[in-house]
Amino acid sequence: YSNFRKSVDSTGRRQYQVQNGPCSYTFLLPETDSCRSSSSPYMSNAVQRDAPLDYDDSVQRLQVLENILENNTQWLMKLENYIQDNMKKEMVEIQQNVVQNQTAVMIEIGTSLLNQTAAQTRKLTDVEAQVLNQTTRLELQLLQHSISTNKLEKQILDQTSEINKLQNKNSFLEQKVLDMEGKHSEQLQSMKEQKDELQVLVSKQSSVIDELEKKLVTATVNNSLLQKQQHDLMETVNSLLTMMSSPNSKSSVAIRKEEQTTFRDCAEIFKSGLTTSGIYTLTFPNSTEEIKAYCDMDVGGGGWTVIQHREDGSVDFQRTWKEYKEGFGSPLGEYWLGNEFVSQLTGQHRYVLKIQLKDWEGNEAHSLYDHFYLAGEESNYRIHLTGLTGTAGKISSISQPGSDFSTKDSDNDKCICKCSQMLSGGWWFDACGPSNLNGQYYPQKQNTNKFNGIKWYYWKGSGYSLKATTMMIRPADF
Protein backbone atom coordinates (compact mmCIF):
# COMPACT_ATOMS: atom_id res chain seq x y z
CA TYR A 1 0.00 0.00 0.00
CA SER A 2 1.13 3.61 -0.38
CA ASN A 3 -0.14 7.04 0.53
CA PHE A 4 0.97 10.66 0.16
CA ARG A 5 0.64 13.25 3.04
CA LYS A 6 1.45 16.91 3.31
CA SER A 7 1.86 18.53 6.77
CA VAL A 8 3.58 21.34 8.77
CA ASP A 9 6.00 20.50 11.57
CA SER A 10 6.38 22.24 14.96
CA THR A 11 8.83 24.80 13.52
CA GLY A 12 6.32 25.72 10.84
CA ARG A 13 8.19 24.10 7.98
CA ARG A 14 6.33 22.19 5.31
CA GLN A 15 7.05 18.48 4.96
CA TYR A 16 6.00 15.88 2.44
CA GLN A 17 5.64 12.25 3.62
CA VAL A 18 5.30 9.30 1.29
CA GLN A 19 4.33 5.98 2.95
CA ASN A 20 5.02 3.06 0.80
CA GLY A 21 4.65 -0.23 2.51
CA PRO A 22 7.28 -0.56 5.16
CA CYS A 23 9.23 2.38 3.71
CA SER A 24 8.48 6.00 4.64
CA TYR A 25 10.01 8.92 2.68
CA THR A 26 10.02 12.38 4.28
CA PHE A 27 10.97 15.45 2.20
CA LEU A 28 11.62 18.74 4.07
CA LEU A 29 11.34 21.72 1.71
CA PRO A 30 13.36 24.90 2.51
CA GLU A 31 11.35 27.88 3.82
CA THR A 32 11.91 31.49 2.74
CA ASP A 33 11.62 32.53 6.35
CA SER A 34 13.69 35.66 5.73
CA CYS A 35 10.90 36.98 3.50
CA ARG A 36 8.47 39.28 5.23
CA SER A 37 4.76 38.64 5.32
CA SER A 38 2.42 40.66 3.13
CA SER A 39 1.35 42.68 6.12
CA SER A 40 4.87 44.12 6.16
CA PRO A 41 5.41 47.50 4.53
CA TYR A 42 7.34 45.70 1.78
CA MET A 43 5.42 42.80 0.37
CA SER A 44 7.07 39.52 -0.62
CA ASN A 45 5.76 37.54 -3.59
CA ALA A 46 3.24 40.25 -4.27
CA VAL A 47 2.74 43.11 -6.69
CA GLN A 48 5.82 45.32 -6.68
CA ARG A 49 5.33 48.35 -4.36
CA ASP A 50 7.00 51.77 -4.58
CA ALA A 51 10.64 51.74 -3.72
CA PRO A 52 11.41 52.18 -0.03
CA LEU A 53 12.09 55.68 1.14
CA ASP A 54 15.21 54.59 2.97
CA TYR A 55 18.04 53.76 0.61
CA ASP A 56 20.04 51.73 3.20
CA ASP A 57 16.97 49.58 3.98
CA SER A 58 16.59 48.77 0.25
CA VAL A 59 20.20 47.70 -0.02
CA GLN A 60 19.89 45.48 3.07
CA ARG A 61 16.75 43.87 1.74
CA LEU A 62 18.38 43.28 -1.62
CA GLN A 63 21.25 41.48 0.10
CA VAL A 64 18.77 39.26 2.04
CA LEU A 65 16.95 38.39 -1.21
CA GLU A 66 20.24 37.57 -2.90
CA ASN A 67 21.18 35.27 0.02
CA ILE A 68 17.79 33.50 -0.17
CA LEU A 69 18.17 33.08 -3.92
CA GLU A 70 21.65 31.61 -3.46
CA ASN A 71 20.43 29.23 -0.69
CA ASN A 72 17.53 28.09 -2.87
CA THR A 73 19.81 27.52 -5.81
CA GLN A 74 22.25 25.48 -3.68
CA TRP A 75 19.41 23.49 -2.14
CA LEU A 76 17.93 22.72 -5.56
CA MET A 77 21.28 21.45 -6.70
CA LYS A 78 21.57 19.30 -3.57
CA LEU A 79 18.01 18.08 -4.04
CA GLU A 80 18.73 17.21 -7.65
CA ASN A 81 21.85 15.29 -6.67
CA TYR A 82 20.02 13.63 -3.79
CA ILE A 83 17.09 12.65 -6.01
CA GLN A 84 19.45 11.34 -8.65
CA ASP A 85 21.49 9.33 -6.11
CA ASN A 86 18.49 8.04 -4.16
CA MET A 87 16.47 7.39 -7.26
CA LYS A 88 19.26 5.21 -8.55
CA LYS A 89 19.41 3.27 -5.29
CA GLU A 90 15.61 3.09 -5.04
CA MET A 91 15.27 2.04 -8.59
CA VAL A 92 17.77 -0.75 -7.99
CA GLU A 93 15.90 -1.79 -4.82
CA ILE A 94 12.58 -1.46 -6.59
CA GLN A 95 13.84 -3.46 -9.45
CA GLN A 96 15.23 -5.91 -7.00
CA ASN A 97 12.56 -5.95 -4.29
CA VAL A 98 9.35 -4.39 -5.51
CA VAL A 99 6.76 -5.95 -7.68
CA GLN A 100 5.46 -4.43 -10.87
CA ASN A 101 2.52 -2.56 -9.34
CA GLN A 102 4.87 -0.55 -7.03
CA THR A 103 6.44 1.06 -10.10
CA ALA A 104 3.29 3.10 -10.52
CA VAL A 105 3.55 4.40 -6.97
CA MET A 106 7.17 5.36 -7.48
CA ILE A 107 6.32 7.08 -10.73
CA GLU A 108 3.59 8.98 -8.86
CA ILE A 109 6.09 9.95 -6.18
CA GLY A 110 8.60 11.02 -8.81
CA THR A 111 5.93 12.95 -10.64
CA SER A 112 4.88 14.60 -7.36
CA LEU A 113 8.46 15.48 -6.57
CA LEU A 114 8.99 16.79 -10.06
CA ASN A 115 5.80 18.88 -9.74
CA GLN A 116 6.99 20.24 -6.41
CA THR A 117 10.39 20.97 -7.87
CA ALA A 118 8.76 22.73 -10.81
CA ALA A 119 6.58 24.73 -8.41
CA GLN A 120 9.59 25.59 -6.31
CA THR A 121 11.46 26.58 -9.46
CA ARG A 122 8.54 28.79 -10.53
CA LYS A 123 8.54 30.36 -7.08
CA LEU A 124 12.26 30.94 -7.34
CA THR A 125 11.77 32.38 -10.83
CA ASP A 126 9.16 34.73 -9.39
CA VAL A 127 11.52 35.72 -6.59
CA GLU A 128 14.30 36.14 -9.13
CA ALA A 129 12.06 38.33 -11.29
CA GLN A 130 11.08 40.35 -8.23
CA VAL A 131 14.65 40.67 -7.17
CA LEU A 132 15.64 41.73 -10.68
CA ASN A 133 12.71 44.16 -10.80
CA GLN A 134 13.61 45.51 -7.37
CA THR A 135 17.29 45.69 -8.33
CA THR A 136 16.43 47.56 -11.52
CA ARG A 137 14.20 49.95 -9.59
CA LEU A 138 16.87 50.40 -6.95
CA GLU A 139 19.47 51.01 -9.63
CA LEU A 140 17.18 53.57 -11.24
CA GLN A 141 16.56 55.14 -7.88
CA LEU A 142 20.25 55.14 -7.13
CA LEU A 143 20.82 56.80 -10.46
CA GLN A 144 18.12 59.37 -9.74
CA HIS A 145 19.54 59.94 -6.25
CA SER A 146 22.96 60.31 -7.78
CA ILE A 147 21.68 62.79 -10.36
CA SER A 148 19.74 64.63 -7.67
CA THR A 149 22.80 64.67 -5.43
CA ASN A 150 24.91 65.99 -8.29
CA LYS A 151 22.33 68.69 -8.96
CA LEU A 152 22.23 69.60 -5.28
CA GLU A 153 25.99 69.63 -5.12
CA LYS A 154 26.07 71.87 -8.19
CA GLN A 155 23.43 74.15 -6.68
CA ILE A 156 25.34 74.27 -3.41
CA LEU A 157 28.51 75.08 -5.30
CA ASP A 158 26.69 77.77 -7.30
CA GLN A 159 25.14 79.20 -4.14
CA THR A 160 28.46 79.09 -2.36
CA SER A 161 30.10 80.97 -5.21
CA GLU A 162 27.15 83.38 -5.25
CA ILE A 163 27.50 83.90 -1.51
CA ASN A 164 31.20 84.48 -1.96
CA LYS A 165 30.47 86.96 -4.73
CA LEU A 166 27.90 88.71 -2.52
CA GLN A 167 30.31 88.73 0.40
CA ASN A 168 32.97 90.24 -1.84
CA LYS A 169 30.45 92.76 -3.16
CA ASN A 170 29.32 93.49 0.38
CA SER A 171 32.88 93.99 1.54
CA PHE A 172 33.46 96.26 -1.45
CA LEU A 173 30.29 98.24 -0.71
CA GLU A 174 31.13 98.41 3.00
CA GLN A 175 34.51 99.77 2.07
CA LYS A 176 32.87 102.22 -0.31
CA VAL A 177 30.42 103.33 2.40
CA LEU A 178 33.27 103.75 4.85
CA ASP A 179 35.20 105.76 2.26
CA MET A 180 32.09 107.85 1.54
CA GLU A 181 31.48 108.33 5.27
CA GLY A 182 35.02 109.52 5.61
CA LYS A 183 34.67 111.87 2.66
CA HIS A 184 31.25 112.99 3.94
CA SER A 185 32.66 113.71 7.38
CA GLU A 186 35.49 115.66 5.80
CA GLN A 187 33.04 117.56 3.58
CA LEU A 188 30.76 118.22 6.56
CA GLN A 189 33.67 119.47 8.58
CA SER A 190 34.76 121.62 5.67
CA MET A 191 31.20 122.92 5.20
CA LYS A 192 30.91 123.64 8.92
CA GLU A 193 34.14 125.56 8.78
CA GLN A 194 32.93 127.40 5.68
CA LYS A 195 29.61 128.10 7.42
CA ASP A 196 31.42 129.47 10.46
CA GLU A 197 33.60 131.60 8.21
CA LEU A 198 30.53 132.81 6.30
CA GLN A 199 28.72 133.60 9.55
CA VAL A 200 31.69 135.62 10.71
CA LEU A 201 31.76 137.32 7.32
CA VAL A 202 28.00 137.96 7.40
CA SER A 203 28.19 139.43 10.90
CA LYS A 204 31.12 141.58 9.79
CA GLN A 205 29.23 142.64 6.68
CA SER A 206 26.10 143.31 8.74
CA SER A 207 28.01 145.60 11.04
CA VAL A 208 29.67 147.24 8.00
CA ILE A 209 26.23 147.67 6.38
CA ASP A 210 24.86 149.15 9.61
CA GLU A 211 27.76 151.56 9.72
CA LEU A 212 27.30 152.42 6.05
CA GLU A 213 23.55 152.94 6.62
CA LYS A 214 24.33 155.25 9.52
CA LYS A 215 26.88 157.08 7.40
CA LEU A 216 24.45 157.26 4.49
CA VAL A 217 21.71 158.70 6.69
CA THR A 218 24.18 161.12 8.27
CA ALA A 219 25.50 162.04 4.83
CA THR A 220 21.97 162.51 3.49
CA VAL A 221 21.03 164.63 6.51
CA ASN A 222 24.29 166.57 6.28
CA ASN A 223 23.84 167.06 2.56
CA SER A 224 20.30 168.31 3.04
CA LEU A 225 21.42 170.55 5.91
CA LEU A 226 24.23 171.93 3.78
CA GLN A 227 21.79 172.58 0.94
CA LYS A 228 19.46 174.29 3.40
CA GLN A 229 22.32 176.29 4.93
CA GLN A 230 23.52 177.30 1.47
CA HIS A 231 19.96 178.32 0.59
CA ASP A 232 19.66 180.29 3.84
CA LEU A 233 23.07 181.91 3.30
CA MET A 234 22.08 182.93 -0.18
CA GLU A 235 18.89 184.44 1.21
CA THR A 236 20.85 186.23 3.95
CA VAL A 237 23.37 187.52 1.42
CA ASN A 238 20.56 188.69 -0.83
CA SER A 239 18.77 190.39 2.06
CA LEU A 240 22.04 192.00 3.17
CA LEU A 241 22.66 193.22 -0.34
CA THR A 242 19.13 194.61 -0.46
CA MET A 243 19.60 196.26 2.92
CA MET A 244 22.97 197.72 1.84
CA SER A 245 21.50 199.10 -1.33
CA SER A 246 18.57 200.63 0.55
CA PRO A 247 19.17 204.29 1.56
CA ASN A 248 17.25 203.92 4.82
CA SER A 249 19.01 200.72 5.77
CA LYS A 250 20.29 200.26 9.25
CA SER A 251 23.16 197.95 9.89
CA SER A 252 21.62 194.89 11.46
CA VAL A 253 22.69 191.39 12.22
CA ALA A 254 20.57 188.49 10.88
CA ILE A 255 19.91 186.29 13.86
CA ARG A 256 19.05 182.75 12.75
CA LYS A 257 17.73 180.04 14.95
CA GLU A 258 19.91 176.94 15.34
CA GLU A 259 19.39 174.22 12.71
CA GLN A 260 17.19 171.31 13.87
CA THR A 261 19.25 168.07 13.82
CA THR A 262 16.88 165.68 15.59
CA PHE A 263 13.49 164.61 14.25
CA ARG A 264 10.58 162.96 16.03
CA ASP A 265 8.93 161.71 12.80
CA CYS A 266 9.27 161.64 9.01
CA ALA A 267 7.01 164.67 8.62
CA GLU A 268 9.60 166.82 10.39
CA ILE A 269 12.33 165.38 8.17
CA PHE A 270 10.23 166.12 5.07
CA LYS A 271 9.60 169.70 6.27
CA SER A 272 13.33 170.14 6.88
CA GLY A 273 13.83 169.66 3.17
CA LEU A 274 14.79 165.99 3.10
CA THR A 275 12.24 164.68 0.61
CA THR A 276 13.79 161.41 -0.51
CA SER A 277 12.21 158.16 0.69
CA GLY A 278 14.58 156.05 2.76
CA ILE A 279 15.82 155.14 6.22
CA TYR A 280 16.13 157.96 8.73
CA THR A 281 16.96 158.18 12.41
CA LEU A 282 14.12 159.37 14.63
CA THR A 283 14.39 160.46 18.26
CA PHE A 284 11.93 159.46 20.97
CA PRO A 285 9.90 162.42 22.24
CA ASN A 286 11.50 164.07 25.31
CA SER A 287 14.46 161.72 25.08
CA THR A 288 17.76 161.15 23.35
CA GLU A 289 16.88 157.55 22.49
CA GLU A 290 16.96 156.94 18.75
CA ILE A 291 15.21 154.57 16.38
CA LYS A 292 15.60 153.88 12.66
CA ALA A 293 12.49 154.15 10.51
CA TYR A 294 11.56 154.09 6.84
CA CYS A 295 10.18 157.40 5.64
CA ASP A 296 7.84 157.38 2.64
CA MET A 297 8.26 160.79 1.06
CA ASP A 298 6.27 159.95 -2.10
CA VAL A 299 2.80 158.64 -1.16
CA GLY A 300 0.05 161.24 -0.74
CA GLY A 301 2.35 164.20 -0.21
CA GLY A 302 5.06 162.36 1.73
CA GLY A 303 6.12 162.71 5.34
CA TRP A 304 4.85 159.23 6.31
CA THR A 305 6.54 157.29 9.13
CA VAL A 306 6.21 153.57 8.25
CA ILE A 307 5.35 151.55 11.37
CA GLN A 308 4.79 148.15 9.68
CA HIS A 309 5.69 146.57 6.36
CA ARG A 310 5.20 143.11 4.85
CA GLU A 311 6.28 142.11 1.35
CA ASP A 312 7.92 138.69 1.02
CA GLY A 313 7.80 136.66 4.25
CA SER A 314 11.52 137.14 4.91
CA VAL A 315 10.94 138.19 8.53
CA ASP A 316 9.23 136.06 11.18
CA PHE A 317 6.40 138.04 12.80
CA GLN A 318 5.58 135.47 15.48
CA ARG A 319 7.52 137.46 18.10
CA THR A 320 7.43 138.18 21.81
CA TRP A 321 5.86 141.13 23.63
CA LYS A 322 9.33 142.67 24.16
CA GLU A 323 10.17 142.40 20.46
CA TYR A 324 6.90 144.04 19.41
CA LYS A 325 7.51 146.72 22.06
CA GLU A 326 11.00 147.58 20.82
CA GLY A 327 10.61 146.73 17.14
CA PHE A 328 12.25 144.17 14.85
CA GLY A 329 13.18 143.51 11.23
CA SER A 330 14.84 145.83 8.73
CA PRO A 331 13.37 149.24 7.74
CA LEU A 332 14.53 148.53 4.17
CA GLY A 333 12.32 145.41 4.06
CA GLU A 334 9.85 143.78 6.41
CA TYR A 335 9.69 145.31 9.88
CA TRP A 336 7.72 146.48 12.93
CA LEU A 337 8.79 149.90 14.20
CA GLY A 338 7.94 149.31 17.85
CA ASN A 339 4.84 149.82 20.03
CA GLU A 340 6.62 151.97 22.62
CA PHE A 341 7.85 154.55 20.13
CA VAL A 342 4.49 154.70 18.32
CA SER A 343 2.65 155.00 21.64
CA GLN A 344 4.85 157.91 22.79
CA LEU A 345 4.69 159.60 19.39
CA THR A 346 0.90 159.37 18.92
CA GLY A 347 0.26 160.32 22.55
CA GLN A 348 1.68 163.84 22.02
CA HIS A 349 0.07 164.93 18.75
CA ARG A 350 -2.89 163.89 16.63
CA TYR A 351 -1.87 161.40 13.94
CA VAL A 352 -3.60 159.79 10.98
CA LEU A 353 -3.04 156.13 10.07
CA LYS A 354 -2.89 154.91 6.49
CA ILE A 355 -2.91 151.20 5.69
CA GLN A 356 -1.91 150.20 2.15
CA LEU A 357 -2.70 146.69 0.91
CA LYS A 358 -1.81 144.61 -2.16
CA ASP A 359 -3.40 141.32 -3.23
CA TRP A 360 -1.96 138.59 -5.45
CA GLU A 361 -4.03 139.66 -8.45
CA GLY A 362 -2.33 143.04 -8.81
CA ASN A 363 -4.97 145.06 -6.97
CA GLU A 364 -4.25 147.72 -4.37
CA ALA A 365 -6.44 149.29 -1.69
CA HIS A 366 -6.09 151.48 1.36
CA SER A 367 -7.80 152.39 4.61
CA LEU A 368 -7.30 155.79 6.18
CA TYR A 369 -8.18 156.59 9.80
CA ASP A 370 -8.26 160.31 10.60
CA HIS A 371 -7.32 159.77 14.24
CA PHE A 372 -5.02 157.04 15.52
CA TYR A 373 -3.16 156.51 18.74
CA LEU A 374 -1.83 153.71 20.93
CA ALA A 375 -2.28 153.69 24.70
CA GLY A 376 0.76 152.99 26.86
CA GLU A 377 2.16 149.62 27.85
CA GLU A 378 0.11 149.68 31.07
CA SER A 379 -2.98 149.51 28.80
CA ASN A 380 -1.39 146.83 26.57
CA TYR A 381 -0.89 149.37 23.75
CA ARG A 382 -4.65 149.44 23.12
CA ILE A 383 -5.46 150.85 19.67
CA HIS A 384 -7.80 153.83 19.16
CA LEU A 385 -9.13 154.57 15.70
CA THR A 386 -11.81 156.90 14.31
CA GLY A 387 -12.92 158.28 10.95
CA LEU A 388 -12.43 155.49 8.42
CA THR A 389 -12.27 156.27 4.70
CA GLY A 390 -10.65 154.49 1.76
CA THR A 391 -11.04 151.63 -0.69
CA ALA A 392 -10.24 148.63 1.55
CA GLY A 393 -13.74 148.28 2.99
CA LYS A 394 -16.43 150.52 4.42
CA ILE A 395 -16.25 148.72 7.76
CA SER A 396 -13.08 148.77 9.82
CA SER A 397 -11.17 145.50 9.73
CA ILE A 398 -9.54 146.52 13.00
CA SER A 399 -12.25 145.78 15.58
CA GLN A 400 -14.05 148.74 17.10
CA PRO A 401 -13.75 149.82 19.84
CA GLY A 402 -10.04 149.14 19.85
CA SER A 403 -8.56 145.99 21.34
CA ASP A 404 -5.45 145.45 23.45
CA PHE A 405 -2.32 144.22 21.74
CA SER A 406 -1.56 140.49 22.11
CA THR A 407 1.53 138.42 21.36
CA LYS A 408 2.37 134.73 21.65
CA ASP A 409 3.57 135.30 25.22
CA SER A 410 1.02 137.94 26.27
CA ASP A 411 -2.63 137.01 25.69
CA ASN A 412 -4.87 140.11 26.01
CA ASP A 413 -7.63 139.26 23.53
CA LYS A 414 -11.36 138.66 24.12
CA CYS A 415 -11.30 135.06 22.91
CA ILE A 416 -11.55 131.85 24.93
CA CYS A 417 -8.59 130.83 22.76
CA LYS A 418 -5.21 132.51 22.41
CA CYS A 419 -5.52 134.38 19.14
CA SER A 420 -1.83 135.17 18.73
CA GLN A 421 -0.94 131.49 18.99
CA MET A 422 -3.85 130.40 16.80
CA LEU A 423 -3.51 133.07 14.11
CA SER A 424 0.24 133.80 14.45
CA GLY A 425 1.82 137.21 15.03
CA GLY A 426 1.19 140.10 17.42
CA TRP A 427 -1.95 142.15 16.76
CA TRP A 428 -4.89 143.99 18.29
CA PHE A 429 -6.91 140.78 18.39
CA ASP A 430 -10.56 140.75 19.38
CA ALA A 431 -11.94 137.19 19.28
CA CYS A 432 -10.06 137.04 17.04
CA GLY A 433 -11.30 139.79 14.69
CA PRO A 434 -11.48 140.66 11.00
CA SER A 435 -7.79 141.47 10.52
CA ASN A 436 -4.24 140.44 11.24
CA LEU A 437 -1.55 142.12 9.16
CA ASN A 438 1.16 140.36 11.15
CA GLY A 439 0.00 136.82 10.28
CA GLN A 440 1.87 134.03 8.56
CA TYR A 441 3.09 135.03 5.08
CA TYR A 442 1.81 132.70 2.32
CA PRO A 443 3.05 132.77 -1.29
CA GLN A 444 0.80 133.01 -4.33
CA LYS A 445 -1.53 130.05 -5.02
CA GLN A 446 -1.14 128.97 -1.39
CA ASN A 447 -2.82 132.06 0.03
CA THR A 448 -6.49 131.05 0.27
CA ASN A 449 -8.46 129.23 2.98
CA LYS A 450 -5.79 130.20 5.52
CA PHE A 451 -6.65 130.40 9.22
CA ASN A 452 -3.49 132.33 10.13
CA GLY A 453 -2.60 134.42 7.09
CA ILE A 454 -2.27 138.19 6.50
CA LYS A 455 -5.92 139.11 6.72
CA TRP A 456 -8.02 142.22 6.02
CA TYR A 457 -11.54 140.82 5.90
CA TYR A 458 -13.49 143.82 4.64
CA TRP A 459 -11.38 144.00 1.51
CA LYS A 460 -10.52 140.41 0.50
CA GLY A 461 -12.76 138.35 2.76
CA SER A 462 -11.83 135.50 5.08
CA GLY A 463 -8.91 133.20 4.59
CA TYR A 464 -7.23 135.37 1.92
CA SER A 465 -3.60 136.05 2.76
CA LEU A 466 -2.34 139.32 1.25
CA LYS A 467 0.82 139.92 -0.80
CA ALA A 468 1.97 143.19 0.78
CA THR A 469 0.95 145.58 3.56
CA THR A 470 2.21 148.92 4.87
CA MET A 471 1.03 150.81 7.95
CA MET A 472 2.16 154.45 8.15
CA ILE A 473 1.40 157.48 10.28
CA ARG A 474 1.62 161.23 9.80
CA PRO A 475 0.57 164.24 11.86
CA ALA A 476 -3.03 165.21 11.13
CA ASP A 477 -1.98 168.81 10.53
CA PHE A 478 0.73 167.98 7.97
Epitope: K414, C415, I416, C417, C419, M422, D430, A431, C432, G433, P434, N449, K450, F451, G453, K455, Y457, Y458, S462, G463
Partner: nanobody
Framework: EVQLVESGGGLVQPGGSLRLSCAVS????????IGWFRQAPGKEREGVSA????????YYADSVKGRFTISSDNSKNTVYLQMNSLRPEDTAVYYC??????????????????????WGQGTLVTVSS
Amino acid sequence: EVQLVESGGGLVQPGGSLRLSCAVSGITLDDYAIGWFRQAPGKEREGVSAIRDNGGSTYYADSVKGRFTISSDNSKNTVYLQMNSLRPEDTAVYYCAAVPAGRLRYGEQWYPIYEYDAWGQGTLVTVSS
Protein backbone atom coordinates in the same frame (compact mmCIF):
# COMPACT_ATOMS: atom_id res chain seq x y z
CA GLU B 1 -4.52 122.35 2.17
CA VAL B 2 -7.98 122.94 3.61
CA GLN B 3 -10.80 122.22 1.19
CA LEU B 4 -14.58 122.33 1.51
CA VAL B 5 -16.78 121.01 -1.29
CA GLU B 6 -20.55 121.56 -1.31
CA SER B 7 -22.98 119.34 -3.22
CA GLY B 8 -26.69 118.52 -3.35
CA GLY B 9 -28.04 121.80 -4.71
CA GLY B 10 -30.58 121.97 -7.49
CA LEU B 11 -34.05 123.02 -8.56
CA VAL B 12 -36.91 122.15 -6.22
CA GLN B 13 -40.56 123.13 -5.97
CA PRO B 14 -41.87 125.16 -3.00
CA GLY B 15 -42.57 122.84 -0.08
CA GLY B 16 -39.97 120.38 -1.35
CA SER B 17 -36.78 119.13 0.30
CA LEU B 18 -33.06 119.05 -0.45
CA ARG B 19 -30.06 117.71 1.42
CA LEU B 20 -26.80 119.60 1.04
CA SER B 21 -23.44 117.99 1.82
CA CYS B 22 -20.15 119.66 2.74
CA ALA B 23 -17.14 117.38 2.37
CA VAL B 24 -14.20 118.70 4.39
CA SER B 25 -10.54 117.77 3.90
CA GLY B 26 -7.29 119.03 5.41
CA ILE B 27 -8.84 119.48 8.87
CA THR B 28 -10.84 117.29 11.27
CA LEU B 29 -14.36 118.20 12.37
CA ASP B 30 -13.41 117.53 16.00
CA ASP B 31 -11.46 120.80 16.16
CA TYR B 32 -13.56 122.99 13.88
CA ALA B 33 -17.04 124.47 13.65
CA ILE B 34 -18.72 124.27 10.25
CA GLY B 35 -21.25 126.87 9.19
CA TRP B 36 -23.70 127.05 6.31
CA PHE B 37 -24.13 130.47 4.69
CA ARG B 38 -26.18 131.68 1.75
CA GLN B 39 -26.04 134.58 -0.62
CA ALA B 40 -28.99 135.58 -2.73
CA PRO B 41 -28.37 137.75 -5.83
CA GLY B 42 -27.72 141.35 -4.81
CA LYS B 43 -27.78 140.57 -1.10
CA GLU B 44 -25.19 140.18 1.67
CA ARG B 45 -23.97 136.72 2.61
CA GLU B 46 -25.85 135.53 5.71
CA GLY B 47 -25.45 132.76 8.23
CA VAL B 48 -27.98 129.90 8.03
CA SER B 49 -26.78 127.22 10.43
CA ALA B 50 -23.66 125.98 12.20
CA ILE B 51 -22.44 122.93 14.10
CA ARG B 52 -19.56 122.11 16.45
CA ASP B 53 -18.47 119.67 19.17
CA ASN B 54 -19.49 116.59 17.14
CA GLY B 55 -23.04 117.89 16.87
CA GLY B 56 -23.22 118.80 20.55
CA SER B 57 -23.92 122.45 19.66
CA THR B 58 -25.98 123.70 16.75
CA TYR B 59 -27.12 127.13 15.61
CA TYR B 60 -29.98 128.14 13.29
CA ALA B 61 -30.96 131.53 11.89
CA ASP B 62 -34.51 132.52 12.84
CA SER B 63 -35.60 132.32 9.20
CA VAL B 64 -34.83 128.57 8.97
CA LYS B 65 -35.62 127.29 12.48
CA GLY B 66 -37.89 124.23 12.38
CA ARG B 67 -37.32 123.69 8.67
CA PHE B 68 -33.56 123.10 8.37
CA THR B 69 -31.50 120.52 10.26
CA ILE B 70 -27.70 120.48 10.45
CA SER B 71 -25.79 117.27 11.20
CA SER B 72 -22.31 115.85 10.84
CA ASP B 73 -20.65 112.51 10.18
CA ASN B 74 -17.15 112.79 11.62
CA SER B 75 -16.09 109.43 10.19
CA LYS B 76 -16.75 110.84 6.70
CA ASN B 77 -15.63 114.37 7.67
CA THR B 78 -18.88 115.63 6.16
CA VAL B 79 -21.55 118.07 7.34
CA TYR B 80 -25.13 117.95 6.05
CA LEU B 81 -27.93 120.50 5.83
CA GLN B 82 -31.37 118.92 5.50
CA MET B 83 -33.71 121.56 4.09
CA ASN B 84 -37.45 120.89 4.30
CA SER B 85 -40.52 123.01 3.46
CA LEU B 86 -38.43 125.09 1.09
CA ARG B 87 -39.66 128.55 0.08
CA PRO B 88 -38.81 130.77 -2.91
CA GLU B 89 -36.92 133.12 -0.53
CA ASP B 90 -34.53 130.23 0.25
CA THR B 91 -33.16 130.55 -3.30
CA ALA B 92 -29.45 131.36 -3.05
CA VAL B 93 -25.95 130.03 -3.45
CA TYR B 94 -25.23 128.00 -0.30
CA TYR B 95 -21.69 127.92 1.09
CA CYS B 96 -20.12 125.93 3.87
CA ALA B 97 -17.20 127.36 5.82
CA ALA B 98 -14.89 126.37 8.67
CA VAL B 99 -13.59 128.13 11.78
CA PRO B 100 -11.39 126.79 14.61
CA ALA B 101 -13.93 125.82 17.28
CA GLY B 102 -12.07 127.71 20.01
CA ARG B 103 -12.24 131.07 18.25
CA LEU B 104 -15.15 132.26 20.40
CA ARG B 105 -15.64 135.51 22.25
CA TYR B 106 -16.12 135.12 26.00
CA GLY B 107 -19.82 134.62 26.78
CA GLU B 108 -20.82 134.06 23.14
CA GLN B 109 -21.98 130.86 21.46
CA TRP B 110 -21.36 131.46 17.77
CA TYR B 111 -18.93 133.09 15.40
CA PRO B 112 -19.12 136.25 13.27
CA ILE B 113 -18.85 135.57 9.55
CA TYR B 114 -15.33 137.07 9.38
CA GLU B 115 -13.99 134.35 11.69
CA TYR B 116 -14.73 131.65 9.09
CA ASP B 117 -11.47 131.53 7.14
CA ALA B 118 -11.98 128.46 4.92
CA TRP B 119 -14.80 128.44 2.37
CA GLY B 120 -16.22 126.19 -0.30
CA GLN B 121 -17.16 127.26 -3.84
CA GLY B 122 -20.91 127.06 -3.16
CA THR B 123 -23.89 125.13 -4.54
CA LEU B 124 -26.95 126.77 -6.08
CA VAL B 125 -30.37 126.08 -4.59
CA THR B 126 -33.37 127.29 -6.62
CA VAL B 127 -36.88 127.08 -5.15
CA SER B 128 -39.39 127.71 -7.89
CA SER B 129 -42.60 126.26 -9.25
